[in-house]
Interface confidence: medium
């Protein structure tokens, strides 16, 4: 299995620095993934005009992408550390099938797409170590994920471009919300 950054691999930028704390490592990991998403969004936006499209709501309804809601306890009002952490991990697990879909959607940034996916797996591992209530985390059903993937891949080109754009945008928003919440923990 791949060695996650910050574990056995070297920290190139500052080899003599104090080891990162668990929270710092998670923060760094999320920021790394967000940088990767920016690079992927750049290719998507250059390739099509989806980034300015106004027909998004239509496609968005069919995707059921994870979103932060008030009840998840991740916002400043009504913040609940345990509930929020469960939501973040559950959401990331739900995003995995969409990140799998992205793997065949990029030409010049295919390596970046792969890095975002693998880094997300590592982030989930980090967060699971932090969580106390792992029983509350529901793992997506592999059969449901497989049929969703088949359905997404069977769309026409326009819808696939739209789906790619929506996944990246939603994942970016989810990670940004997660980052803000985790900094309060």
């Amino acid at each position: 299995a791949p060695v996650p950054p910050g574990e056995d691999s070297k920290d190139v930028a500052a080899p003599h620095r104090q080891p990162l704390t668990s929270s710092e490592r998670i923060d760094k990991q999320i920021r790394y993934i967000l940088d990767g998403i920016s690079a992927l969004r750049k290719e998507t936006c250059n390739k099509s005009n989806m980034c300015e499209s106004s027909k998004e709501a239509l496609a968005e309804n069919n995707l059921n992408l994870p979103k932060m809601a008030e009840k998840d306890g991740c916002f400043q009002s009504g913040f609940n550390e345990e509930t929020c952490l469960v939501k973040i991990i559950t959401g990331l697990l739900e995003f995995e099938v969409y990140l799998e879909y992205l793997q065949n959607r990029f030409e010049s940034s295919e390596e970046q797409a792969r890095a975002v996916q693998m880094s997300t797996k590592v982030l989930i591992q980090f967060l699971q170590k932090k969580a106390k209530n792992l029983d509350a985390i529901t793992t997506p059903d592999p059969t449901t994920n497989a049929s969703l993937l088949t359905k997404l891949q069977a769309q026409n080109q326009w819808l696939q471009d739209m789906t790619t754009h929506l996944i990246l945008r939603s994942f970016k928003e989810f990670l940004q919300s997660s980052l803000r919440a985790l900094r309060q923990m």
Partner: antibody, heavy 114, light 109 residues
Framework: SVEESGGRLVAPGGSLTLTCKAS????????VSWVRQAPGKGLEWIGY??????ISYANWAKGRFTISKTSSTTVDLEMTSLTTEDTATYFC???????????WGPGTLVTVSS | QVLTQTPASVSAAVGGTVTISCQSS????????LSWYQQKPGQPPKLLIY???KLASGVPSRFSGSGSGTQFTLTISGVQCDDAATYYC??????????FGGGTEVVVV
């Protein structure tokens, strides 16, 4: 471009570190694979360090081979307990071997012999 | 993860067609992460096809790739003398693991 260095004659049981130097791109935008080819034989994938710094190895390479990013433009391949079976040309590759942007170095020859 | 290439060697007349098969012991990553390389003596391999069927930059259109999952094919239509080389398939698997097929030598007669 990428270029390998460090290949030489080494005695069985010895160790050797090869270096891959990247020019014209940064390792923050591309990963690096190591591949080897014994004289007259096929290609053999050793391992890969991604832009996320995750490292993966072929099963046979685990334990004796270590890949590490040593700077923003260099990646090392450290090899230990070398045997005559490790005699090969070692290639450094920009990207993963199945990706469209791959770029291969000319290779560096490692000879394990007493 | 094993990639089995057949045949090990093939002869072709100029203008003829060559088909090389590559079978994987399990699905390659995303069913598509399989590439084809051409290698001539004393040179590093040259990428021909990536993601099973996409032609790499600067590669002549007489080279084509097909397949998905575990079964892949490289076809050279209208073989030329310059195509004499060894051809390798390369796959990626879950966890970022890679492997090469054993190679197919193409002799042009």
């Amino acid at each position: 471009s990428v270029e390998e260095s460090g290949g030489r004659l080494v005695a069985p049981g010895g160790s050797l570190t090869l270096t891959c130097k990247a020019s014209g791109f940064s390792l923050s935008s591309s990963g690096v694979s190591w591949v080897r080819q014994a004289p007259g034989k096929g290609l053999e994938w050793i391992g890969y360090v991604s832009i996320a710094d995750t490292i993966s190895y072929a099963n046979w390479a685990k334990g004796r081979f270590t890949i590490s990013k040593t700077s923003s433009t260099t990646v090392d391949l450290e090899m230990t307990s070398l045997t005559t079976e490790d005699t090969a040309t070692y290639f450094c590759v920009r990207g993963f071997i199945t990706y469209s942007g791959v770029l291969w170095g000319p290779g560096t020859l490692v000879t394990v012999s007493s | 993860q094993v990639l089995t290439q057949t045949p090990a060697s093939v002869s072709a007349a100029v203008g003829g067609t060559v088909t090389i098969s590559c079978q994987s012991s399990q699905n390659v990553y995303s069913n598509a992460f399989l590439s084809w390389y051409q290698q001539k003596p004393g040179q590093p391999p040259k990428l021909l096809i990536y993601k099973a069927s996409k032609l790499a930059s600067g590669v002549p259109s007489r080279f084509s790739g097909s397949g998905s999952g575990t079964q892949f094919t490289l076809t050279i239509s209208g073989v030329q003398c310059d195509d004499a080389a060894t051809y390798y398939c390369a796959g990626e698997y879950e966890g970022g693991i890679g492997t090469f097929g054993g190679g197919t030598e193409v002799v042009v007669v």
